[in-house]
């Protein structure tokens, strides 16, 4: 499903290519902004975001941000241009097809972020790189 408030033009006229010359088409990403989450102490979680969006620009990638403080845990899912910082951090892993979470230094909270470039790749956020996607027992996340 593509929600109208985030669905943007799929621009076939202004061609954007990657470093190999392949056309970069607008990507499909989970796009729920910030939601409360119970994803904690797991190797992997599903976003449980029901909104799949076509990103506004072909160069945008999927991003997920997991934050934990004394009060709650949140998961943010968006599209974002990797040329621009997000939450003051560069998206170093934007070319990855999977969303491998990396911890970032943020005072007062635990902060993980990942970015990736395959359709809806921020639906499955991976905290352990050796995680095997075929194990369904690791895919539990409930939103409040």
């Amino acid at each position: 499903t593509i929600p109208p408030h985030v669905q943007k033009s799929v621009n076939n006229d202004m061609i954007v290519t990657d470093n190999n010359g392949a056309v970069k088409f607008p990507q499909l990403c989970k796009f729920c902004d910030v939601r409360f989450s119970t994803c904690d102490n797991q190797k992997s979680c599903m976003s449980n975001c029901s909104i799949t969006s076509i990103c506004e620009k072909p160069q945008e990638v999927c991003v997920a941000v997991w934050r934990k403080n004394d009060e709650n845990i949140t998961l943010e899912t968006v599209c974002h241009d990797p040329k621009l910082p997000y939450h003051d951090f560069i998206l170093e892993d934007a070319a990855s097809p999977k969303c491998i979470m990396k911890e970032k230094k943020k005072p007062g909270e635990t902060f993980f972020m990942c970015s990736c470039s395959s359709d809806e790749c921020n639906d499955n956020i991976i905290f352990s790189e050796e995680y095997n996607t075929s194990n369904p027992d690791l895919l539990l996340v409930i939103f409040q």
Partner: antibody
Framework: QVQLVESGGGLVEPGGSLRLSCAAS????????MSWVRQAPGKGLEWVGR??????????DFAAPVKGRFTISRDDSKNTLYLQMNSLKTEDTAVYYC???????WGQGTLVTVSS | DIQMTQSPSSLSASVGDRVTITCRAS??????LNWYQQKPGKAPKLLIY???SLQSGVPSRFSGSGSGTDFTLTISSLQPEDFATYYC?????????FGQGTKVEIK
């Protein structure tokens, strides 16, 4: 330039099988959800099914009329999408289009005729 | 599945005419509605997405409106290249279903 080229269409008898292929180029195929849409002669468009990326498990969805008879697969190493059609019926006669799911890229279509 | 019903199924019009095609969904689909144009022997081309947003490269004489269950595609001044078949499609839920099409013919 994005290119989607379907092949494998032809004449088949009712109850028979056929496998369509879609060769993709010009984009990172492995990163994309892909769909099949069909159009019976002189009729409208009908979504057949989709396959998600291998990275997310390669899950598939199908329209009710083809569920259990058609399967969709992909070979990311060959940049190729497949539609395996079994137990074909005369009402499956159509031009089958390969599409980049939910985006405006379509192949030229390949005609499948189911007839005795 | 959500059923999409277009009307009329065909219409005859002249160059310069204002043309309106309607699409009704069997249940509310918010604004998750796309319009396609198809010419004989060709693949469909996306014109309007999210009910009212114009796809890049599509002439501004095409416009879309509506939300919920009732939607409209309008061609403000029909041009020779606009004679084609038009389809609505909902992208609210899987399967993403199409209307049966509206053929716009030369009067």
């Amino acid at each position: 330039q994005v290119q989607l080229v379907e092949s494998g269409g032809g004449l088949v008898e009712p109850g028979g099988s056929l496998r369509l292929s879609c060769a993709a180029s010009g984009f990172t195929f492995s990163n994309a959800w892909m769909s099949w849409v069909r159009q019976a002669p002189g009729k409208g468009l009908e979504w057949v099914g989709r396959i998600k990326t291998t990275y997310s498990g390669g899950a598939t969805d199908f329209a009710a009329p083809v569920k259990g008879r058609f399967t969709i697969s992909r070979d990311d190493s060959k940049n190729t999408l497949y539609l395996q059609m079994n137990s074909l019926k005369t009402e499956d006669t159509a031009v089958y289009y390969c599409t980049l799911d939910l985006r405006d890229y379509w192949g030229q279509g390949t005609l499948v005729t189911v007839s005795s | 599945d959500i059923q999409m019903t277009q009307s009329p199924s065909s219409l005859s019009a002249s160059v310069g005419d204002r043309v309106t095609i309607t699409c009704r969904a069997s249940q509310s689909i918010s604004s998750y509605l796309n319009w396609y144009q198809q010419k004989p022997g060709k693949a469909p081309k996306l014109l309007i997405y999210a009910a009212s947003s114009l796809q890049s490269g599509v002439p501004s004489r095409f416009s879309g409106s509506g939300s919920g269950t009732d939607f409209t595609l309008t061609i403000s001044s029909l041009q020779p290249e606009d004679f084609a078949t038009y389809y609505c499609q909902q992208s609210y839920s899987t399967p993403p279903t199409f209307g049966q099409g509206t053929k716009v013919e030369i009067k």
